[in-house]
């Protein structure tokens, strides 16, 4: 299936140009999306091109500026947040990135009623997290690892926690491992729906081993960065959940929420918190051996002033074939009765589907079914459930939005997006206003992305929010590569692949092949999305064929494929890349003497193992920030898929699956190893150990480090990285500069 045909015709050839590396590094062909900042059923905020904050009312068609760019500029604000009572706006400035999601910032409160900044009892700086209550204008914020509450922006703060300590105790914000591998947020506090209660997590990292690395900076002596970071098998953070009444917080004090007995009996994680009503909360817990998850519904007992989590409201989710959930355990979406909920988990056939749970998980009613997967539940209203899946036309790399009518029996299903812009749009997400009165659809491809506004009742398109016209015009004279998404059937395994072909691709010719791999558990690389990136350039200008293959361990195609890698990472992911390459060679247009593989992070691990597989298939390859041994990576992620590195568990495979163990096999390939020295995620240690093993084996290789750069290798390092990799590949493929 050709998803993005080249628009090249002979008559136009002389006016068309190939992509350049400069185009990619400058972001010349980047696209925009439009996500409304919903503030009611029919109103949203949006930051205009000139930085005014504008309120749009869909029903009246009116819009007005609620905050001028002048006010924004007066404090150098880069972000904002309107209080639900619309009396105040917080303005965020001095953004300072910490880890993937976390950052600190300075916050100013602007009073919309008098057009002035709130003076007196100003917020301290820098703040780690700040948010409004869902109703009114209470503020909760985290400063120096402690949580504070303001009843009104001008009021003095009430300190809720006192034990916060850098790198030791985290209140209301996650530590490194919870941020990266469990919550995927910068916050760990949650307001109840009407702002009566505030729930928060406390993470105790006192006993966690610390990763230390040098940050060279500009000073005479480097700084040492210390992060409590539990590697596989190490001591983990200890988590507690508390809830405090925010109306009169000084009286009762924080109430600790009990952990289910079956969870508390051994090491465990807290995985998420969902408020149902002001007096009902749902907590999800997970055993350290991550195949058992417990969802616990707790009720506030007014007469006892306590949170009661009866055993009858504990719902167990267990996997017998792998780990619980997909990448994360899914979160529940509660229905209007405030006790039953919808949740995605594996059905009896091993496909992730929506289930309705009223009393017990055993009695769950399956809402969706088929040899495809439900991916996200966006919204449940009284009569509709909106979700995304990859059902349509059996392409796992697509996302369409569906509506199920739950108000009628039997429930009827309608695909909202399948036929809207069928060629252009096959990968959607959505954003819903209150009560799903309206929603925005954001289409990511395969054509140029487009964002549209829709009526939540009729699904009618109301207007285009962003259609990337400038991008469309800019691409008119560009020779884009062709892209096709197809599948290989090998030994009862379906391997979906995306192939990016040079604009004047000729099947009778031979082309160098570059495999781009990620391949991590529950990932998906073969997606019907638009991108003009480095590999687009390599196909367009340098005439390479690039292929991405989703092998065993990847997501959204059922548990058989997903859980195939359970407890044996580094085996089947590599095998399936190799199998695909052999199939590509059979297609006849690949120069089998010029095949390379590259990947980043997990992809760097897979590419390294593929190069060291001893197959002789690969001439060269690149590993950027690779994992080299699972003993070096984070406990939460690693143990989910590998178990523990202990003799009585899975130590043997931990040892067998290292890159270092295969050092000898790099002798006949050209290997480029790249890593940032300040990588907080996949530590530089990983590449240091690969390099040491290669040196000890007297194997030649190339390497590049990026001083003081993290796992993202951002800024000027990005330009240097892609330029360096380009030279390496062109040399490998004997392409002239």
């Amino acid at each position: 299936i050709v998803l993005r045909p080249s628009r090249v015709h002979n008559s136009e050839e002389n006016t068309m140009r190939a992509l350049t590396l400069k185009d990619i590094l400058n972001g010349t062909f980047s696209y925009k999306t439009f996500f409304p900042n919903w503030i009611s059923g029919q109103e949203y905020l949006h930051q205009s091109a000139d930085n005014n904050i504008v309120l749009y009312n869909i029903e009246t068609g009116q819009s007005y500026t609620i905050l001028s760019n002048r006010t924004m500029k007066s404090v150098n604000a880069s972000n904002y947040g309107l209080s639900p009572d619309r009396q105040f706006v917080y303005l965020e400035s001095d953004y300072s990135k910490l880890w993937r999601y976390s950052y600190t910032a300075t916050y100013y409160i602007y009073d919309l009623s008098n057009g002035e900044f709130v003076r007196g009892n100003e917020l301290p700086r820098p703040i780690q997290y700040l948010c409004w209550s869902p109703v009114g204008s209470k503020l909760a914020y985290v400063y120096q690892n402690n949580i504070y509450l303001k009843q009104r922006p001008g009021d003095p703060p009430f300190q809720i926690t006192f034990n916060g300590r850098e790198n030791k105790i985290f209140n209301g914000i996650p530590d490194w491992v919870y941020e990266e591998e469990m919550l995927a947020t910068k916050y760990a506090l949650w307001w109840s729906p009407n702002g009566k209660f505030l729930a928060y997590a406390e993470f105790n990292d006192t006993d966690i081993p610390v990763i230390a690395y040098s940050y060279y900076g500009d000073e005479q002596y480097p700084r040492t960065i210390n992060i409590p970071y539990p590697k596989a098998g190490a001591k983990n953070p200890v988590v507690r959940i508390f809830i405090i009444d925010t109306t009169y917080p000084a009286y009762v004090g924080p109430q600790e929420v009990p952990v289910p007995a079956m969870i508390a009996s051994s090491d465990y994680y807290f995985s998420w918190l969902t408020w149902v009503t002001d007096e009902r909360v749902c907590l999800q817990w997970l055993k350290r051996v991550q195949n058992v998850s417990v969802l616990s519904i707790c009720d506030f007992r007014e007469d006892w002033q306590t949170w009661d989590c009866p055993k009858t409201q504990e719902h167990i989710e267990e996997s017998r074939t792998g780990w619980a959930g997909g990448f994360f355990v899914s979160t529940p979406v509660f229905s209007y009765d405030a006790i039953s909920y919808y949740k995605i988990f594996s059905d009896k056939d091993g496909y992730k589907h929506i289930h309705y749970i009223k009393d017990t998980v055993e009695n769950a009613i399956q809402i969706t079914s088929g040899k495809w997967e439900a991916i996200n539940i966006f919204r449940v209203t009284q009569d509709s459930l909106f979700y995304s899946s990859n059902e349509f036309e059996e392409y796992p790399g697509r996302r369409n939005i569906y509506r199920i009518s739950i108000g009628s029996y039997p429930p009827s299903k309608k695909c909202v997006t399948c036929h809207l812009r069928k060629e252009r749009c096959q990968y959607y997400t959505a954003s819903f206003s209150d009560y799903a009165k309206y929603y925005a659809l954001v289409c990511y491809g395969p054509g140029i992305p487009i964002s549209t506004l829709h009526d939540g009742r009729t699904d009618q398109e109301i207007k285009i929010l962003e259609e990337n016209k400038e991008l469309e015009n800019a691409l008119k004279n560009i020779q884009l590569p062709k892209e096709e998404i197809k599948k290989l059937e090998v030994d009862e395994i379906t391997l979906w692949y995306k192939m990016i072909l040079p604009p004047q691709f000729d099947r009778s010719k031979k082309y160098p092949l570059l495999i781009q791999v990620y391949g991590g558990p529950c990932s998906q690389s073969v997606r019907s999305v638009f991108a003009v990136n480095w590999i687009s350039y390599l196909a367009s200008k340098e005439g390479m064929v690039i292929a991405l293959v989703d092998g065993r361990g990847t997501a959204f195609q059922g548990d058989k494929l997903l859980y195939a890698v359970y407890r044996k990472l580094g085996v089947y992911e590599v095998e399936d890349q190799i199998t695909a390459v052999r199939k590509f060679i059979e297609m006849g247009f690949i120069d089998e003497k010029r095949i390379a593989i590259w990947g980043w992070s997990y992809g760097g691990y897979v590419s390294s193992l593929a190069l060291a597989s001893g197959t002789g298939l690969f001439k060269c390859g690149i590993a950027v920030a690779p994992v080299s041994s699972w003993e070096y990576y984070a406990s939460v992620y690693t143990e989910r898929f590998m178990g523990l590195p202990t003799k009585d568990d899975n130590l043997e495979h931990y040892k067998n699956s290292t890159v270092m163990a295969r050092a000898e096999y790099f002798r006949n390939v050209d290997y480029l190893l790249i890593h940032g020295t300040a990588d907080d995620n996949v530590h530089f240690q990983n590449s240091a150990q690969i390099a040491k093993a290669l040196v000890n084996a007297q194997v030649d290789f190339q390497a590049m480090w990026y001083s003081d750069q993290n796992h993202g290798l951002s800024g000027l390092s990005t330009n240097h990285l892609y330029t360096h990799m380009t030279h390496f590949l062109k040399q490998c493929f004997s392409l002239s500069d």
């Epitope: 007196g120 009892n121 009843q151 009104r152 009021d155 003095p156 703060p157 009430f158 300190q159 006192f162 034990n163 507690r240 109306t247 009169y248 000084a250 009286y251 009762v252 004090g253 924080p254 109430q255 600790e256 007469d303 006892w304 002033q305 306590t306």
Partner: antibody, heavy 117, light 108 residues
Framework: EVQLLESGGGLVQPGGSLRLSCAAS????????MSWVRQAPGKKLEWVSA????????YYADSVKGRFTISRDNSKNTLYLQMNSLRAEDTAVYYC??????????WGQGTLVTVSS | EIVLTQSPGTLSLSPGERATLSCRAS???????LAWYQQKPGQAPRLLIN???RRATGIPDRFSGSGSGTDFTLTISRLEPEDFAVYYC?????????FGQGTKVEIK
Amino acid sequence: EVQLLESGGGLVQPGGSLRLSCAASGFTFSSYAMSWVRQAPGKKLEWVSAIIGSGSRTYYADSVKGRFTISRDNSKNTLYLQMNSLRAEDTAVYYCAKGWFGGFNYWGQGTLVTVSS
Amino acid sequence: EIVLTQSPGTLSLSPGERATLSCRASQSVTSSYLAWYQQKPGQAPRLLINVGSRRATGIPDRFSGSGSGTDFTLTISRLEPEDFAVYYCQQGIMLPPTFGQGTKVEIK
């Protein structure tokens, strides 16, 4: 009916130790933060220490930090204050009170601690 | 720590009169975190006005609390004989919780 009953007070020499107890009844003890508040003869009230309902978090006035330890046994509905390295200035009537940092709506009758040689 | 200063130190009034007791904080407190107590000789304090200017359970409506920021007032609209006692204000917004030095309301 809520009742708080302190015990364990008495005469002790400087540097000595005492353990105060407060038996609670008439409410769900484990749900509430509890505090100790003291009052030296003829002086104003002074908050000493607090503990949240589960017992997992404790708080102290600077004047007693490192010397006093607050604890609770929710199975016995009892609050404790272990007082070590006592000083003359710790002489006071010690009250246990229901509440964390404010709105102390129930108080015990108090127990007198006298630190003197 | 927040210092609470009560005035006057002593208030001499007759039964039936109106009593106005003042409490000033060294920094902003807000009514959500200020409480008033009554203490009679040899007895434990008794909560009158709970945080948030709410009357505590069983407290007659002649007692009322008001104020915001740093200035707070306890008003007893008509003094009854049993109201003669020492009154303390207390803040709970900042650790450590602190009490005022007290206002003694005595019979004139």
